[in-house]
Interface confidence: low
């Protein structure tokens, strides 16, 4: 499932006024684009130019983070008179473009998405033929990517005065809500300890002591789904297991 | 004929102001973007402002951003940069210069004034 | 900003010799740079653009070259009227970016 916000045209000219009705260099591109970690998306990008019937050569450029300056995740080249956009670049090989250049649009599919693919992208043109002239989007599209909850790390560490702490990592977006239960924390409890903390699509949570011998489960869970896991704490000679 | 002719150079104390001018002709300015490009007494060249053909898009560089001020008349040919809060460091010969491309890019200067000496010394 | 690098900072040459001046850009900028000339107490002229395109009224001694990163301005055979400074200006993107200049001297 893809859901795209309301397109916005990134236009520095055509809020000017002009006696002759020539076309002048605009981008749209949508706000945000979202789709769930594991699927694709695609990234709408169409432009307009002032170079009437442009069939010099061409390339395709996006680019993610920042624009101008950002690294490149794809690129193609056209030749003079092909509608055939030659990928010179795709990162790890999942980006597509969809659209045609030669038609004014530059769409690109992103397959395989991965939280780390959540970020602005920014689409570039150039013209380098009898007319040399390029533009890039100023503002870019956000690909907003979705993700159930997924525990990536759970673990029991020295804490002071010879007690034991536990710590949960979690991913997912939107970020996941943490919860513990164990012995004495009561059952199910739902408390979200205050130490918890978020960091880009990682959510940890501590709890700081562990008093009682026993299971201590961590849960996950957010708007897409949960996910839980746990350690088991048995106090032999002072030390720990956890699995 | 094609040319660029700047004028309202100076000498000003540190913290005044100045406007300076570009008169166009010979082309259809409203068509290309324009800009202002300095060199300080021995030294390179420096990029200091660019405005869209329209007017629309004003773009600086961060030395100058908030004290300098581009603007263009199309009626008149005119190109403008206004100069606030004058530095020492804005000492330097500012050439104003035409875009080779019509769009609000300007790809590369294809035509340059003579330039005009703006000193800034108490 | 994109950092535009000029090598060598000075060459000196003797009329009749090639001569070729590099520049090197910061980042990637595609073929949007350009060459000038500028000799002293005058502007600029323009050379060539898009990295290889020669300026209309230049005589074709001189030449551009490269993309991405790493550029080359060739004068074939120089002239008197060659000796000068000059300049590469990236157009990639704005804040527009010079290099330090070269300057041509005779040898």
């Known amino acids: 499932f893809v859901r795209t916000k309301i397109d916005t045209t990134e236009n520095l000219l055509n809020t000017e006024v002009h006696s002759s009705p020539v076309q002048r260099w605009s981008m749209q591109v949508p706000a945000e684009v979202s789709a769930a970690a594991g699927d694709a998306a695609v990234l709408p990008c169409t432009f307009t130019h002032p170079h009437r019937h442009y069939d010099g050569p061409l390339t395709a450029i996006w680019r993610a983070g920042e624009p101008y300056a950002g690294p490149q995740v794809f690129r193609c080249a056209a030749a003079r008179g092909s509608e055939l956009c030659q990928t010179a670049l795709s990162l790890h090989g999942r980006f597509r473009l969809l659209g045609n250049p030669r038609r004014n649009d530059l769409s690109l599919r992103v397959e395989r998405l991965a939280l780390a693919d959540d970020r602005r992208y920014f689409c570039r043109v150039e013209f380098a033929g009898d007319v040399h002239d390029r533009y890039e989007s100023r503002h870019g599209v956000r690909l907003h990517v979705t993700a159930a909850p997924r525990i990536i790390n759970i673990s029991v560490l020295p804490g002071p005065a010879h007690a034991f702490r536990a710590l949960c990592t979690t991913e997912g977006e939107p970020p996941p809500a943490l919860a513990w239960s164990g012995p004495a924390l009561g059952n199910g409890s739902a408390a979200v300890p205050s130490s918890g903390q978020g960091h880009g699509h990682l959510v940890t949570a501590e709890l700081p002591a562990l008093n009682h011998d026993g299971r201590y489960t961590c849960t996950a869970a957010n708007s897409l789904g949960r996910s839980e896991a746990s350690v088991y704490l048995f106090r032999f000679h002072g030390a720990s297991a956890s699995t | 004929e094609v040319q660029l002719l700047e004028s309202g150079g100076g000498l000003v104390q540190p913290g005044g102001s100045l406007r300076l001018s570009c008169a166009a002709s010979?082309?259809?300015?409203?068509?290309?973007?324009m800009s202002w490009v300095r060199q300080a007494p021995g030294k390179g060249l420096e990029w200091v402002s660019t405005?869209?053909?329209?007017?629309?898009?004003?773009y600086y560089a961060d030395s100058v951003k908030g004290r300098f001020t581009i603007s263009r008349d199309n009626s008149k040919n005119t190109l403008y940069l206004q100069m606030n809060s004058l530095r020492a460091e804005d000492t330097a010969v500012y050439y104003c210069?035409?875009?080779?491309?019509?769009?609000?890019?300007?790809?590369?200067?294809?035509?340059w004034g003579q330039g005009t000496m703006v000193t800034v010394s108490s | 900003d994109i950092q535009m690098t000029q090598s060598p900072s000075s060459v000196s040459a003797s009329v009749g010799d090639r001569v070729t001046i590099t520049c090197r850009a910061s980042?990637?900028?595609?073929?949007?740079l350009a060459w000038y000339q500028q000799k002293p107490g005058k502007a600029p002229k323009l050379l060539i653009y898009?990295?290889?395109s020669l300026q209309s009224g230049v005589p074709s001694r001189f030449s551009g070259s490269g993309s991405g990163t790493d550029f080359t301005l060739t004068i074939s055979s120089l002239q008197p009227e060659d000796f000068a400074t000059y300049y590469c200006?990236?157009?990639?993107?704005?804040?527009?970016?010079f290099g330090q200049g070269t300057k041509l001297e005779i040898k």
């Open positions: 210069a035409k875009a080779i491309g019509s769009s609000w890019y300007s790809d590369a200067f294809d035509l």
């Open positions: 010979g082309f259809t300015f409203s068509s290309y973007a």
């Open positions: 405005i869209s053909g329209g007017g629309g898009s004003t």
């Open positions: 980042q990637d900028i595609s073929s949007w």
């Open positions: 898009v990295a290889s």
């Open positions: 200006q990236q157009s990639y993107s704005i804040p527009y970016t």
